[in-house]
C-alpha cells in the first residue's frame, strides 16, 4: 500500500497489522451528481450486442442489490434485426468492491469483498488474425 | 436499509443512526477464484467500438488505482477496419463504491463514495430524431 | 415432444441434385435457429448449414458454399436443404438439428437422420 | 477454422469407473463449448454447453470444465449406457467445429 502521511486529527486505531480494520462512514457521497453521466439507460437495447439485465439480491453484501448483464444472443446484431454469426456478443466484466457483513448479519461489521460483475455487453471478432 | 436480525456475537456499537459508522475488514476476500471469468482482457482491441484504458490514480481512494474506458471512435469499426459513422461507440457506465479517506489522510478511516466509472464500450444505433 | 424427422435421401449421381426435408413438432419453429450436421460413415460431425429463427441469417462452410442452400418455411415449420453439384465427398447421413436459441450455435435436439450416397 | 482435437481417440473403462475425455481448441474459444454423446446408429445427444452447463435430464455424473483452449468431459463413475462416442463442439467462431470424437468401449 502507499504510505500515508498520519493526519493528528485522525481516529486512533491500535492495529497496524494486515488484515486491517478500518472505520468506514456508510453516508454515501455521490460524486456523479457534479457530473453528467452519459444515459446509457437504454443503450441495453440498441446495442449491436444487447443485454437484459437481471437483478442479484443480498442482504448480507451492501448494496444488497447488484444488476448482472446478460447478453441476449451469441452472435451480434445487424441492421436488419438478424443475427451476425461472424461476430461474437460477450460480456464486459469488471471487479468491484462490496461489502459482506462479517460474522453474518451483523449490522455494523464487514469485510471487504471483491466481485466480478457484467456490466454490458460488447460486439467482437472471434478471431485475431495474426500477422507473419 | 433491510432489518438484520441481530447476532448476539457481532462487535458492539454504539451508533445506531445514520450516518453510520462501521467497522470494516480490509483483507479482501476474493470470490472470483471460485469461478471461471471470461477473460475479456482483449475485447477493448477486438471490439466493433474498442476502448483504450486510462489509469486513474488517487491515494486518498481505496482501491487508489481505477481503469477507465475511452472510447476510441465515435463511429463503429467495419469488419474491413473502417469505421462506420452510422453508428455510435459509447462507453457503458457503471456506479461503483470506493472508500475515501475522511479525514484526509487517515490511514484508518474512510467514507463510502459512488462514483461512476467507464468499464468499456457498445457500439450502438444511434437515435434518430424524426422532424413532423 | 420435440421431434425431428428427415426426408429426401437416397443415391444420386455426381453433378446432381436433391433436397432434404425436415418436419418439426412439438415446438414453436418459428422461434428457433436450424441447423443441417452430417455425418460421414464411420466419421466424425461436420456442419453443412446453419438458419436463424426467421430466415434472416444464414451460414455455409466453404465445403458446401455456392452448392447447398439451407431454407425454412415456418408456416409450414420445415427446414431444407438443397444440395447442387453433389460430390461423391457429400456422401453422409444428414441431420437437421435445433439451437435451444433463436440462432443455430450448438444442438439440443436432433432428428434421426438422412442417408446421402453420391455415387456414379 | 478451428480445429478441436479430443483426445484419447478411444479408451476401455469398466463400470464405476472415473473417464476423462478432453478437447483442446487450436484457439482460445471463451468457454463456447458443447458435449455430445452418440451411440451407435443413434443421432447425437447434448450433454453440456458453455462448457460447464448440464443438460436437463443429463445425469449429475457427467461434468464439463476447462477454459481457454483445454476442455474436459468427466464422467464420475461409469455406467452401463455411458458407453458411446462423444463429441465436443465449439461455437465461437463459424465454422462451428467438432472434435474427432473419443469411444468409450467396456474393457
Known amino acids: 500500500g502507499i504510505a500515508i502521511p498520519r493526519n493528528s486529527g485522525c481516529p486512533n486505531s491500535e492495529d497496524k497489522n494486515f488484515p486491517r480494520t478500518v472505520m468506514v462512514n456508510l453516508n454515501i457521497h455521490n460524486r456523479n451528481t457534479s457530473t453528467n453521466p452519459k444515459r446509457s439507460s437504454d443503450y441495453y437495447n440498441r446495442s449491436t450486442s444487447p443485454w437484459n439485465l437481471h437483478r442479484n439480491e443480498d442482504p448480507e453484501r451492501y448494496p444488497s442489490v447488484i444488476w448482472e448483464a446478460k447478453c441476449r444472443h451469441l452472435g451480434c446484431v445487424k441492421a436488419d434485426g438478424n443475427v451476425d454469426y461472424h461476430m461474437n456478443s460477450v460480456p464486459i466484466q469488471q471487479e468491484i468492491l462490496v461489502l459482506r457483513r462479517e460474522p453474518r448479519h451483523c449490522p455494523n461489521s464487514f469485510r471487504l469483498e471483491k466481485i466480478l460483475v457484467s456490466v454490458g455487453c460488447t460486439c467482437v471478432t472471434p478471431i485475431v488474425h495474426h500477422v507473419a | 436499509g433491510i432489518a438484520i436480525p441481530r447476532n448476539s456475537g457481532c462487535p458492539n456499537s454504539e451508533d445506531k443512526n445514520f450516518p453510520r459508522t462501521v467497522m470494516v475488514n480490509l483483507n479482501i476476500h476474493n470470490r472470483n477464484t471460485s469461478t471461471n471469468p471470461k477473460r475479456s482482457s482483449d475485447y477493448y482491441n477486438r471490439s466493433t467500438s474498442p476502448w483504450n484504458l486510462h489509469r486513474n490514480e488517487d491515494p486518498e481512494r481505496y482501491p487508489s488505482v481505477i481503469w477507465e474506458a475511452k472510447c476510441r471512435h465515435l463511429g463503429c469499426v467495419k469488419a474491413d477496419g473502417n469505421v462506420d459513422y452510422h453508428m455510435n461507440s459509447v462507453p457503458i457506465q457503471q456506479e461503483i463504491l470506493v472508500l475515501r479517506r475522511e479525514p484526509r489522510h487517515c490511514p484508518n478511516s474512510f467514507r463510502l463514495e459512488k462514483i461512476l466509472v467507464s468499464v468499456g464500450c457498445t457500439c450502438v444505433t444511434p437515435i434518430v430524431h424524426h422532424v413532423a | 415432444e420435440v421431434q425431428l424427422v428427415e426426408s429426401g435421401g437416397g443415391v444420386v449421381q455426381p453433378g446432381r441434385s436433391l433436397r432434404l426435408s425436415c418436419a418439426a413438432s412439438g415446438f414453436t419453429f418459428s422461434t428457433y435457429g436450424m441447423s443441417w450436421v452430417r455425418q460421414a460413415p464411420g466419421k466424425g460431425l461436420e456442419l453443412v448449414a446453419i438458419i436463424n429463427h426467421n430466415g434472416g441469417s444464414t451460414f455455409y462452410p466453404d465445403s458446401v458454399k455456392g452448392r447447398f442452400t439451407i431454407s425454412r418455411d415456418n408456416s409450414k415449420n420445415t427446414l431444407y436443404l438443397q444440395m447442387n453439384s453433389l460430390r461423391a465427398e457429400d456422401t453422409a447421413v444428414y441431420y437437421c438439428a435445433r439451437d435451444p436459441r433463436h440462432d443455430g450455435y450448438f444442438f439440443d435436439y436432433w432428428g434421426q437422420g438422412t442417408l446421402v450416397t453420391v455415387s456414379s | 477454422d478451428i480445429q478441436m482435437t479430443q483426445s484419447p481417440s478411444s479408451l476401455s473403462a469398466s463400470v464405476g469407473d472415473r473417464v476423462t475425455i478432453t478437447c483442446r481448441a487450436s484457439e482460445d474459444i471463451y468457454d463456447r463449448l458443447a458435449w455430445y454423446q452418440q451411440k451407435p446408429g443413434k443421432a447425437p445427444n447434448l450433454l453440456v454447453s458453455g462448457a460447464t452447463s448440464l443438460e436437463s435430464g443429463v445425469p449429475s455424473r457427467f461434468s464439463g470444465s476447462g477454459s481457454g483452449k483445454d476442455y474436459t468431459l468427466t464422467i464420475s463413475s461409469l455406467q452401463p449406457e455411458d458407453f458411446a462416442t462423444y463429441y465436443c463442439?465449439?461455437?465461437?467462431?463459424?465454422?462451428?467445429?467438432f472434435g474427432g470424437g473419443t469411444k468409450v468401449e467396456i474393457k
Open positions: 463442439q465449439q461455437y465461437w467462431s463459424v465454422p462451428w467445429t
